[in-house]
Interface confidence: low
């Protein structure tokens, strides 16, 4: 009679994580008597996966009824597959022995590869804000996928970026893999509403890539431009001085008026006007009583934006240009009349 053969028809199978894997095995003879065992891996360190005669294997079921006298199908089904189940599985026939069974013949093995979806990409930007024209780095991470092949792309407002570096770890074989990518983005003044997108494509996603996003509003700081102007007002000897603070982001802003270098008033920005590009405008004004001054006045609008060093703009108020009251017995009014912002 022809010697028993152990036939594993599938050289490899690929299963999605969470599904069941069926490993096929048939023998060509009922002789010699002895059990079938399934192992993952070969050699001394191999792992017992299923033993026909003994053991507790809750995730493993047999495809056919092994209690049938003439059964020669020893295929098994492993439920709830995870990436940790990847490997080569061997169906091994043992010959009955005492005290131990003796290995008789092994199948050629079936390689099980597990397809596991990558986790949702997480995009993170720099810890500190940066100003337009600066280059900032964004990182994108995704984990737990298998097989190793994966595609990662970066976009800014739908435009694909090219300045990035990507690594897939580990370099060698593993049950699952992680991807880490760093992209460089040059900021512009118009980026408050911009988004950076990391897109990951993998065989398990069936053409529907995963995306992670970062809003540049959390990264960018647009410093303000200042303009100080004066307009006469109807009341004699009074001038209205305004400080226009334009195109800044984020909102956090404090403004200080100085009169000849001395602090006159400090206020925090409120009631801002938002521009289409996401930046803000604000205006503060002062009423200056020129009759209280004998000499020219230097007015300075000083702005501290988002904790950064102050920027300022000055305006020289020419006192001589305004007629002074002659012979007035009344005490002069305050040089600077406090006024709420418009």
């Amino acid at each position: 009679e022809e010697e028993l053969q152990v036939i594993q028809p599938d050289k490899s199978i690929s299963v999605a994580a969470g599904e069941s894997a069926t490993l096929h095995c048939t023998v060509t003879s009922l002789i010699p008597v002895g059990p079938i065992q399934w192992f993952r891996g070969a050699g001394p360190g191999r792992e017992l996966i299923y033993n026909q005669k003994e053991g507790h294997f809750p995730r493993v079921t047999t495809v056919s009824d092994l209690t049938k006298r003439n059964n020669m199908d020893f295929s098994i089904r492993i439920s709830n597959i995870t990436p940790a189940d990847a490997g080569t599985y061997y169906c091994v026939k043992f010959r009955k022995g005492s005290p131990d069974h003796v290995e008789f013949k092994s199948g050629a093995g079936t390689e099980l590869s597990v397809r596991a979806k990558p986790s949702a990409p997480v995009v993170s930007g720099p810890a500190a804000r940066a100003t337009p024209q600066h280059t900032v780095s964004f990182t994108c991470e995704s984990h737990g996928f298998s097989p190793r092949d994966i595609t990662l792309k970066w976009f800014k407002n739908g435009n694909e970026l090219s300045d990035f570096q990507t690594n897939v770890d580990p370099a060698g074989d593993s049950v699952s893999y992680s991807i880490h990518s760093t992209a460089k983005v040059v900021l512009t003044r118009e980026d408050v509403h911009s988004q950076v997108i990391c897109e990951v494509a993998h065989v398990t996603l069936q053409g529907d890539p995963l995306r992670g996003t970062a809003n540049l509003s959390e990264t960018i700081r647009v410093p303000p431009t200042l303009e100080v102007t004066q307009q006469p007002v109807r009341a004699e000897n009074q001038v209205n001085v305004t400080c226009q603070v334009r195109k800044f982001y984020p909102q956090r802003l404090q403004l200080t008026w100085l009169e000849n270098g001395n602090v006159s008033r400090t206020e925090t920005a409120s009631t801002l006007t938002e521009n289409k590009d996401g930046t803000y405008n604000w205006m503060s004004w002062l009423l200056v009583n020129v009759s209280a001054h004998r000499d020219d006045v230097k007015l300075t609008c000083q702005v501290e934006h988002d904790g950064q060093p102050a920027v300022s703009k000055s305006h020289d108020l020419k006192v001589s240009a305004h007629p002074k009251e002659q012979g007035s017995n009344t005490a002069p009014g305050p040089a600077l009349a406090s006024a709420a912002p418009l």
């Epitope: 059990p35 017992l48 996966i49 033993n51 005669k53 003994e54 809750p58 005290p99």
Partner: antibody
Framework: QSVEESGGRLVTPGTPLTLTCTVS????????MHWVRQAPGKGLEWIGI?????ATSYATWAKGQFTISKTSTTVDLKITSPTTEDTATYFC?????????????WGPGTLVTVSL | QIVMTQTPFSVSAVVGGTVTIKCQAS??????LAWYQQKPGQRPKLLIY???TLASGVSSRFKGSGSGTEFTLTISGVESADAATYYC????????????FGGGTEVVVK
């Protein structure tokens, strides 16, 4: 029905050591056997199992460091190349069924000390 | 791989009181869970298996409950002899596991 470990002693790192578990009152052809260890002041750590048919399985950390084998009345645990981290009391325990599930008979343990 | 996490690390009890120890499995293990008691210098002793079945000769003051991933050991009417370390153990499967036992909970009886 009982099990008892022996062979524990002081060894230097790298010196192979074999511990033996002797069973009485039951047959190793009906019950799987386990080895479990416990480092001083630490918890229980499962090492591996030998089934009635002689097949073995090991904890992921124990593969290559330990080998389990048996005769008709004894189960051996070989520590291939001990390190100081292997200092522990080693227990053998009987499975409550012919396969893996629970441990219902334990030996008193044997102490292995690995030191220079 | 299945990881067993036990809480708390240590618990203090008064004689006659009640102690609750929790064990969490990282995967669904059905009812394949056992509890062991180990006193200092002694071998572990099987208390409960299949999550809630008392082992032979074990006092009914010990009660196991739970299934899936969350399990509880309750000791009622605590006695001074209950001072020990208690371990949970998954009996679900040993392919690719690091350890089948939880980290242990020390019960101190005052």
């Amino acid at each position: 029905q009982s099990v008892e470990e022996s062979g524990g002693r002081l060894v230097t790192p790298g010196t192979p050591l074999t511990l033996t578990c002797t069973v009485s009152g039951f047959s190793l052809s009906n019950y799987a056997m386990h080895w479990v260890r416990q480092a001083p002041g630490k918890g229980l750590e499962w090492i591996g199992i030998i089934y009635t048919g002689g097949a073995t399985s090991y904890a992921t950390w124990a593969k290559g460091q330990f080998t389990i084998s048996k005769t008709s009345t004894t189960v051996d645990l070989k520590i291939t190349s001990p390190t100081t981290e292997d200092t522990a009391t080693y227990f053998c325990a009987r499975g409550d069924r012919d396969g893996y599930a629970y441990f219902n008979i334990w030996g008193p343990g044997t102490l292995v000390t690995v030191s220079l | 791989q299945i990881v067993m996490t036990q809480t708390p690390f240590s618990v203090s009890a008064v004689v006659g009181g009640t102690v609750t120890i929790k064990c969490q499995a990282s995967h669904n293990i059905g009812s394949w869970l056992a509890w062991y008691q180990q006193k200092p210098g002694q071998r572990p002793k099987l208390l409960i298996y299949d999550a809630s079945t008392l082992a032979s000769g074990v006092s009914s003051r010990f009660k196991g409950s739970g299934s899936g991933t969350e399990f509880t050991l309750t000791i009622s009417g605590v006695e001074s002899a209950d001072a020990a370390t208690y371990y949970c153990q998954q009996g679900y499967g040993i392919s690719y596991v690091h350890n089948v036992f939880g980290g242990g909970t020390e019960v101190v009886v005052k």
